[in-house]
């Protein structure tokens, strides 16, 4: 503790100029004071002034008023500093002396004589209020006041609490009257050294180094650090924890960049045709009658469906067609015959069967021939059986589909995975992506097809924590950590969902 006992001398009256021994001073009593402050004693005794002592220069002759003086000799109030916890009780002895000698340092002069003395014993609390008193004896009167105040930076009832206001990284505070800390705005904690972050800043995912700031820990973003950062390269996905890539509906693949719903997202099929999804970026258009092409974008001739039967020839008209029938046939599609089996109407070895009591007939055609009169060679490609832009080819009694790259199956209906050819070397994992296959390489290899052996293995130093698996070749950093459940971060170094006191990393 540390404080000051202050004594203010106000007026001394010694009208007759007398000493304590009854003698008078000549020419008058040139008066100075000796003050002794000590611990409380029920009966004041001689001995050391345990709390301090002080003397004044000559302040006046016989009777005088003592003016306040802040510096130099004759300072008033008198200061008695102490470096201990103020006990709350004290004993004070004030002696008035006459000196025939030096005004400024009468204490050292020989022949000094006591004029009078007073003794005060009691309790005194620390405070700014002066306690005023007056002591009389038969010859003199002394008016004075006194108090105990704490030294600078000391506080409390006994001046025992040291507190120094500060505003640096070890504290941002002022001192209360009792010595406790009062944090400056924006700061908190026992020593006011912890900044109060931006209101709403996520307790675990954000932090601050000064008030009203919100700095995000790795894997988090947003003004309040409450939005996770998805995996680098995540196209159509979101995250609930950092570095995740949970695909939006209709998207797939490691980076959610493979379109599983091409039909809905791109509407590739034209002219009212039906679109069917078939794997990543795969689709098939089923055309309405009168349209053809991969996207049903090509309008067919009205005669393309060969509507005229029995060898009738078809002529396109503005919104329809017209059939020119051969001899012996009539009707919109030349479907009615005036011939009978007697006219040998069946070509290419077809057998004629009479119908309706011989008034009409039906031809039974040999293989590879069709038509009412077996007049047409069978074209197995007319039904557009090849999907995904495959080319149809007649091969004798059958037909085959010649598929475009990336498709297979009898009707080219199957999408071939780019990964089926196992393009990744050295045990790399293949991912079908929009622009071709992408390889995730095992430790020690890189390149588009994991064909390059890495002399310095980015995973060799074990950069991934908490049992995470390390992959190279997926990111510009040369490695990617695949975190186990319960951990996040670019190196899987952060546990998920720890209590607020957990010391996160910046």
């Amino acid at each position: 503790g540390s404080g000051i006992f202050q004594l203010r001398l106000q007026e001394f009256v010694n009208q007759r100029g007398m000493l304590a021994n009854g003698q008078s001073c000549e020419p008058g009593c040139r008066t100075f004071f000796r003050i002794c402050l000590k611990h409380f004693q029920a009966t004041f005794s001689e001995g050391p002034c345990t709390f301090g002592n002080v003397s004044t220069p000559v302040l006046g002759t016989n009777s005088f008023v003592v003016r306040d003086k802040n510096s130099g000799s004759g300072r008033n109030p008198l200061q008695l500093p102490f470096n201990f916890t103020w006990p709350g009780t004290f004993s004070l002895n004030i002696q008035a002396w006459h000196t025939p000698g030096d005004d400024l340092r009468p204490e050292t002069s020989p022949g000094n004589s006591l004029i009078s003395q007073i003794i005060i014993q009691g309790s005194l609390a620390v405070g700014k209020i002066w306690r005023t008193d007056e002591q009389n004896d038969t010859l003199t009167r002394l008016s004075y006041s006194y108090r105990v105040i704490c030294s600078d930076n000391y506080y409390g009832e006994s001046c025992s609490r040291l507190c120094k206001k500060r505003d640096d990284h070890f504290g941002h505070y002022e001192c209360q009257p009792d010595g406790s800390l009062s944090c400056l705005p924006g700061w908190t904690g026992k020593y006011c050294d912890q900044p109060i972050c931006l209101s709403g800043c996520h307790e675990q995912n954000g932090y601050c180094s000064k008030p009203d700031e919100c700095i995000c820990r790795p894997g988090w973003q947003g003004r309040l650090c409450n939005e996770c950062i998805p995996h680098n390269g995540c196209r159509h996905g979101t995250c609930s924890i950092p570095w995740q890539c949970a695909c939006d509906e209709g998207w797939g693949g490691l980076f959610c960049d493979q379109d599983l719903n091409y039909c809905t997202h791109h509407s590739p099929c034209k002219n009212g045709s039906t679109c069917s999804n078939s794997g990543p970026k795969g689709y098939t258009c089923t055309c309405l009658p009168g349209y053809t092409g991969e996207h049903c974008e090509l309008g067919l001739s009205k005669c393309a469906s060969n509507p005229c039967r029995n060898g009738g020839s078809c002529k396109d008209q503005e919104n329809s067609y017209h059939c020119l029938c051969p001899p012996g046939y009539y009707g919109q599609h030349c479907e009615h015959s005036t011939l009978t089996c007697a006219d040998s109407p069946c070509f290419n070895g077809g057998s004629c069967r009479e119908r309706n009591q011989g008034s009409s007939y039906a031809c039974e055609c040999p293989p590879n021939f069709t038509g009412s009169n077996c007049e047409k060679k069978v074209d197995r490609c007319t039904s557009n059986p090849c999907a995904n832009g495959g080319q149809c080819q007649n091969r004798g009694p059958s037909r085959t589909c010649r598929c475009r790259p990336g498709f297979t199956g009898t009707h080219c209906e199957l999408h071939i995975s780019d990964c089926a050819r196992s393009p990744c070397a050295h045990g790399g994992t293949c991912h079908d992506l929009e622009n071709g296959p992408v390889c995730t390489c095992p430790a020690g290899f890189s390149g588009r097809r994991c064909e390059v052996r890495i002399t310095h293995d980015a995973c060799a130093s074990g950069p991934c924590f908490n049992g995470a698996t390390c992959y190279t070749g997926l990111s510009p950093n040369n490695f990617v950590c695949n975190c186990p459940y319960g951990f996040v971060g670019s190196r899987c170094e952060f546990p998920v969902g720890l209590p607020p006191s957990f010391p996160w990393v910046a």
Partner: antibody
Framework: EVQLQESGPGLVKPSETLSLTCTVS??????????WGWIRQPPGKGLEWIGD???????YYNPSLKSRVTISVDTSKNQFSLKLSSVTAADTAVYYC?????????????WGQGTLVTVSS | SYELTQPPSVSVSPGQTASITCSGQ??????ASWYQQKPGQSPVLVIY???KRPSGIPERFSGSNSGDTATLTISGTQPMDEADYYC?????????FGYGTRVTVLG
């Protein structure tokens, strides 16, 4: 018992960058009660405070060295580091790392044993 | 920039009291720390917060700080107290050390 250990090259060429690391053992560098500082002492001379860092990455530097100093922290390794660029012979000194305690009003209660760095070609 | 001034040297006889001063503008309004450094060793904190002793520091070491001066007092000085002593304070966010005082124990 907390221990601090400095490590790094003992010889650096003029104009190059001095790099030192302090490894903390026996306690977490992520405690909110401490800052982690660097102090140096040229041969036969007094102590000079270089700068310090909090576990969150907040740094404070001696204004006379600020343009050349970078202090960083790696909480996963319980380490903090010093980089001093464009060194000259005047940067030859014993470099200490120390723990500055908020509770001790910034007093440094634990020090490394120091490492002598000589700047010479 | 803020400076702390110490006397270069102080000599004391064994068993006597050594006082080392540290002066700086309004130093009493800052917290002063004191460090002891023996040759070839790292500094050791002997006083913090003006007058408090860390555990393990003998009672003969005491400190005070008011006005412009902080003082480290070694009462009953022993030969083992011979060392360099540095005062330290914080000026805003910068640590400042005094120039150091060599304490020599005579005899």
């Amino acid at each position: 018992e907390v221990q601090l250990q400095e490590s790094g090259p003992g010889l650096v060429k003029p104009s190059e960058t001095l790099s030192l690391t302090c490894t903390v053992s026996g306690g977490s560098i992520s405690s909110s009660s401490y800052y982690w500082g660097w102090i140096r002492q040229p041969p036969g001379k007094g102590l000079e405070w270089i700068g310090d860092i909090y576990y969150t990455g907040s740094t404070y530097y001696n204004p006379s060295l600020k343009s050349r100093v970078t202090i960083s922290v790696d909480t996963s390794k319980n380490q903090f580091s010093l980089k001093l660029s464009s060194v000259t012979a005047a940067d030859t000194a014993v470099y200490y790392c120390a723990r500055e305690d908020v509770i001790l009003r910034g007093g440094s209660d634990y020090w490394g044993q120091g490492t002598l760095v000589t700047v010479s070609s | 920039s803020y400076e702390l001034t110490q006397p270069p040297s102080v000599s004391v006889s064994p068993g006597q009291t050594a006082s080392i001063t540290c002066s700086g503008q309004r130093l009493g309004d800052k917290y002063a720390s004191w460090y002891q450094q023996k040759p070839g060793q790292s500094p050791v904190l002997v006083i913090y917060e003006d007058s408090k002793r860390p555990s393990g520091i003998p009672e003969r070491f005491s400190g005070s700080n008011s006005g412009d001066t902080a003082t480290l007092t070694i009462s009953g000085t022993q030969p083992m107290d011979e060392a360099d002593y540095y005062c330290q304070a914080w000026d805003r966010d910068t640590g400042v050390f005094g120039y150091g005082t060599r304490v020599t124990v005579l005899g």
